[in-house]
Interface confidence: medium
């Protein structure tokens, strides 16, 4: 069978090969389409309700004034010329409709790096057959389920026209340190070959890089954390975050049973105060953050103190694992 594609709503003429150019003709057309239950036979005499759908022209061709989805199917013509030679024509008719230009709706103006974001929803209305939607980043096809890309698709069919509406929702996880203004577009590829893709206007959301949590700083006075017996050590916890979080104090990896405070004063230092101190900021929006540890030690008279900033100490050296 010869494949014929016709646009919905447009006329179609199918030639009956071997038929005399004008009556009298011995020919018949047989149709098996969405309009017929089995084979429907049409003759040049015509007449009746079928004339509005398909009729045989004086030259034997079959004329369909406006093809529809129901006209998809097989069309056969059997004709006999003046010498009694029989010729058969066989057509497989498929119809199509190009939708309007696809559009991206509900598009995001800003994406957050490192987390999944909805970019937008691509919509194509009025296609037949359904066709497909695909997404592009900077002109290159995006592959679903690769590198933080996911696509949710939906296909609906209009109950009266039979035409398709396609929707495709794109989710991406932009890489940190990536392109700050990526270009996304969506294209519709028709279900029938030989028709070019239709592409949306591009969108260019901004990519916002969440600022990493600023470090909690622990300042010790005297610098280096070495003090003579009976001296005083002041530990100050500096947190840039706003609003100010609660500050808790740890010694050798164990919280000290003290009310929250950004300053810890150790007056009249004794041997029991020696150890590794750190502060912990507790925020309502995310988990606690801990400073680096500082080592507090006692210098006996005549001893040299440790070099300034003996930071890092025993971390969890003892952690009350007695």
């Amino acid at each position: 069978a010869q494949n014929i594609t016709a646009r919905i709503g447009e006329p179609l003429v199918l030639k009956c090969k071997g038929a005399p150019k004008k009556p009298p003709q011995r020919l018949e057309w047989k149709l098996n389409t969405g309009r017929t239950e089995a084979w429907k036979v049409l003759s040049p005499q015509g007449g009746g309700p079928w004339d509005s759908v398909a009729r045989v022209l004086p030259n034997g061709s079959l004329f369909l004034p406006a093809v529809g989805i129901q006209d998809e199917g097989i069309f056969r013509c059997q004709a006999m010329n003046r010498n009694g030679k029989e010729t058969k024509s066989n057509y497989r008719v498929r119809v199509y409709q190009i939708p309007g230009k696809p559009e991206i709706v509900d598009s995001a103006s800003e994406l957050t790096a490192g987390v999944p974001n909805k970019v937008g929803t691509c919509v194509s209305e009025g296609s037949y057959p359904a066709g497909t939607l695909s997404w592009h980043l900077d002109g290159k096809p995006l592959v679903p389920n690769e590198k933080g890309v996911s696509v949710k698709e939906q296909t609906r069919r209009h109950p009266e026209t039979g035409l398709f509406t396609l929707q495709s929702e794109l989710m991406v996880t932009p890489a940190r340190g990536g392109d700050p203004r990526p270009t996304f577009s969506c294209s519709f590829s028709p279900g029938l070959p030989r028709h070019r893709a239709l592409r949306t206007a591009p969108i260019q959301p901004r990519v916002w890089e969440p600022v990493p949590l600023e470090e909690v700083q622990l300042v010790v006075e005297p610098e280096g954390g070495a003090v003579a017996p009976g001296g005083t050590v002041t530990l100050t916890c500096e947190v840039p975050a706003q609003p100010s979080p609660q500050i808790h104090w740890m010694k050798d990896g164990v919280p000290l049973p003290l009310p929250p405070s950004p300053v810890l004063i150790l007056p009249e230092i004794g041997p029991q105060d020696q150890g590794t101190y750190s502060c912990v900021a507790t925020h309502s929006s995310h988990g606690p953050q801990e400073s680096r540890a500082v080592s507090i030690s006692i210098i006996e008279p005549g001893e040299e103190g440790p070099t300034a900033g003996s930071v890092g100490g025993s971390g969890l050296g003892t952690l009350a694992l007695a």
């Epitope: 801990e290 100490g313 969890l316």
Partner: nanobody
Framework: AVQLVESGGGLVQPGGSLRLSCVVS????????MSWVRQAPGKGLEWVSA????????SYAGSVKGRFTISRDNAKNTVYLQMNSLEPEDTAIYYC??????????WGQGTQVTVSS
């Protein structure tokens, strides 16, 4: 990025049990001692229990000794806290904490445990 994710919290009646888990990613788990620290409503941080990097030694706060058990599975990068005979005083956010010499401690987001009848 270092990440500690706690789970297993919930509402339980007095005398009941819960098992908290903390899955760690982004660093060499077996090199870190792990501990559980809790914060009751309106209170400061309270250390609950700790386990050494190899799991050979554990310790507990007096208030939970005999009721709570800490363990770790280095193959699964996970530390557990089995909590039995729970009491209303155990109601708190429970944080998982990883630390080793010379590094700031790393903390999870916490999981809420509520003991109430």
């Amino acid at each position: 990025a270092v990440q500690l994710v706690e789970s297993g919290g919930g509402l339980v009646q007095p005398g009941g049990s819960l098992r908290l888990s903390c899955v760690v990613s982004g660093f060499t788990f077996r090199s870190y001692a792990m501990s559980w620290v809790r914060q009751a409503p309106g209170k400061g941080l309270e250390w609950v229990s700790a386990i050494t990097s190899g799991g050979e030694s554990t310790s507990y706060a007096g208030s939970v000794k005999g009721r709570f058990t800490i363990s770790r599975d280095n193959a699964k990068n996970t530390v557990y806290l089995q909590m039995n005979s729970l009491e209303p005083e155990d109601t708190a956010i429970y944080y998982c904490n990883a630390r080793r010499v010379g590094s700031p401690g790393s903390w999870g987001q916490g999981t809420q445990v509520t003991v109430s009848s």
